[in-house]
Each structure stands twice: as C-alpha cells, then as structure tokens.
Amino acid sequence: GSERTCCPVNWVEHERSCYWFSRSGKAWADADNYCRLEDAHLVVVTSWEEQKFVQHHIGPVNTWMGLHDQNGPWKWVDGTDYETGFKNWRPEQPDDWYGHGLGGGEDCAHFTDDGRWNDDVCQRPYRWVCETELDKASQEPPLL
C-alpha cells in the first residue's frame, strides 16, 4: 500500500513525524516545492517540545518554516489553525517590515539564530525543514 510506516533514509523520526533538514538555502516558495516533491511540507510547529527538537537540529541559522501570510492572514501550510496554535515570535514580530528596500513587506516566517520566529522577505535563500507525518494507520494499536 501507500502507507508510510517509517522515515525515509536521511530523515529524522520524532514523535511520529519525519523531518529533513536542508544544508543549503532556497527562497521560501522553492523550499515549499521541494518539500511537497517529497510528499511532505515545510515544518509546522505545534508545540514547545517540537520547537525545541527543530531548534536543536538547525542550530543558530535562519531557517524557513511552513508559515506565511502571503494571502493576508498567517497560515500554516498543512491547514493547522494559526490563531489557536503554538507561536514563538521574537518580541515585536511579525512586523511586515518594508524598510529592507527589496519591495513589499515580509510574508514568510523563519527560525532565527535563537530559535524564535521572525517574518522576512520570502525570496531570501534560507535553509529549510521538511516534515511528513507517519501514517495514522500505522499508529493505531493492533485489534485483538
């Protein structure tokens, strides 16, 4: 079948999800495409525990996550509700800053060097993290 019961080679398993950490940089949209090409998505952070796990693996490097407001409100790429969900913005962020001189504001979220989040220009070539969930079918205990 098409069930994914274990993580692919070079992916890291954690709490029934698989994570892949890039070592090169891409614009947010290209990173998003490369995650989707793997039947995955840019990482969606749903808890402090997941935040610490990702932060441990990426180190103090700007890294894209699956959160953006390119169409207005902030949205997670997998549909997780932003308003009620986990957040870890830096103080006074997001600020949709226009002063960078690159045109437009800042519509894509990334982990900063201390792990907290910032919004930035989506074209910046940052590293990225892909996430895919192990299939729910494989998480259920066997029927007795």
């Epitope: 892949w20 890039s22 891409k26 290209d30 490369y34 989707r36 090409l37 793997e38 039947d39």
Partner: antibody, heavy 121, light 107 residues
Framework: EVQLLESGGGLVQPGGSLRLSCAAS????????MSWVRQAPGKGLEWVSA????????FYADSVKGRFTISRDNSKNTLYLQMNSLRAEDTAVFYC??????????????WGQGTLVTVSS | EIVMTQSPATLSVSPGERATLSCRAS??????LAWYQLKPGQAPRLLIY???ARATGIPARFSGSGSGTEFTLTISSLQSEDFAFYYC?????????FGGGTKVEIK
C-alpha cells in the same frame, strides 16, 4: 535495470486531447518523483510537469498549466500525462524522466526514449 | 524564471581534442546544475549533477565546474560516441529550466 517506456503519442488536431503513459520498471517506482520533459522540433529541452512519489503534489510549467494533468498509478508502476486543449506549439517529443531522489534537488538520472506528439490540422 | 544560456550553439572539434561547453544562468543557481547528453532516437543521459559530480557510469573524460552563474562542461579527449547535443539544467529555482543546448560535431 531501470527502464522507462513512453506510449500514447500520435497526431491530434488543435484543441484535441491525448494521454501519454510511461511504464516504469527496475526501481521502487513509488519512492521517486517523476517528470515529463519535452523537446519541440529543432528546439531545446523544456520541463513540463512533475509529480511526487506518492502523488500528493503536482507541478507544472506555466505553458501547460490548466491544460495538462500529471498523475501516477503506483500499483501499475505507470506515469501519465493527460493533455487537453492541445496547440500546434505543443508538438514535441515527450520524455518521461525519473528524479535522482536526493531531497532538495530535481534532476533526472533515467529517461525514456520519448514519444512524439504532433498537433496539426 | 531563470534563463539558462549555452554557448556556443555549435562546437566543431576533432576526435581526441578537448571540448569546452559553457552554460550561463541569468541569476545565481548556486551549484544546482546538471548536464545531459542527447543523441537522436536515444534516451537522454545524465552526465553531471551538483555542477561537478559525475553521474554513475560516466567516463572520467567528462568533468563539470563552476558555481553561481557560470558553468563549464569539459570533455577532455573527444571520442566518436561523444558527438551529440549537450544541455544544462538548473534546479535551484522552480520552474526547472534548461539551456538551449550545444551541438558538438566532428570537425
């Protein structure tokens, strides 16, 4: 040995439809993204479309978006390209290509020999 | 979209000589570049990926170099089977784009 065999090409009138198939063997088909790449007569290569290994995500060149649909049947180890509203400029040899499989890249380590699509009245 | 420009369009070389093919990107593609060989009626063949890594089974006479916007494919000593079309492809950015190709012909 990896093999990719395209079929389904032929002559079709402008506005018509055609479905290309690519039968794959020699590798775990569902583990690899696949693409269609074309070459118009006397022209260079043009990437047309890609699909993820399990088929959850698809990608298209602007020139075919809304007209072409890529799909796959992993139980049959087969890749498809449904082409609608065909135009004269779609005339080309269409190649099926296997992604190398390195995350964060997409280049093609195996290709088929191609199938010719001719759009003409 | 990143535009890939290959030069020359045609390269006339004698067997045993060196061939140097150029590929230029309209903006930086880092090292996200592949080279392919095409012969009429045959399946295209991957030669080089990541700008300089030789694909499995590719002879050592093929080498790739460059990064950013300027790339080179070198065939150190042309064999009869090397006369063909050569294309570069960038995968730094979507959509994926190819160069217009270089034809290597017998001088």
């Amino acid at each position: 040995e990896v093999q990719l065999l395209e079929s389904g090409g032929g002559l079709v009138q402008p506005g018509g439809s055609l479905r290309l198939s690519c039968a794959a063997s020699g590798f775990t088909f569902s583990s690899y993204a696949m693409s269609w790449v074309r070459q118009a007569p006397g022209k260079g290569l043009e990437w047309v479309s890609a699909i993820s290994g399990r088929g959850s995500s698809t990608f298209y060149a602007d020139s075919v978006k809304g007209r072409f649909t890529i799909s796959r049947d992993n139980s049959k180890n087969t890749l498809y390209l449904q082409m609608n509203s065909l135009r004269a400029e779609d005339t080309a040899v269409f190649y099926c290509a296997k992604d190398h499989g390195i995350v964060g890249t997409i280049y093609f380590d195996y290709w088929g020999q191609g199938t010719l699509v001719t759009v003409s009245s | 979209e990143i535009v890939m420009t290959q030069s020359p369009a045609t390269l006339s070389v004698s067997p045993g000589e060196r061939a140097t093919l150029s590929c230029r990107a309209s903006q930086s593609v880092s090292s996200d570049l592949a080279w392919y060989q095409l012969k009429p009626g045959q399946a295209p063949r991957l030669l080089i990926y990541d700008a300089s890594a030789r694909a499995t089974g590719i002879p050592a006479r093929f080498s790739g170099s460059g990064s950013g916007t300027e790339f080179t494919l070198t065939i150190s000593s042309l064999q009869s089977e090397d006369f063909a079309f050569y294309y570069c492809q960038q995968y730094y950015n979507w959509p994926l784009t190819f160069g217009g190709g270089t034809k290597v012909e017998i001088k």
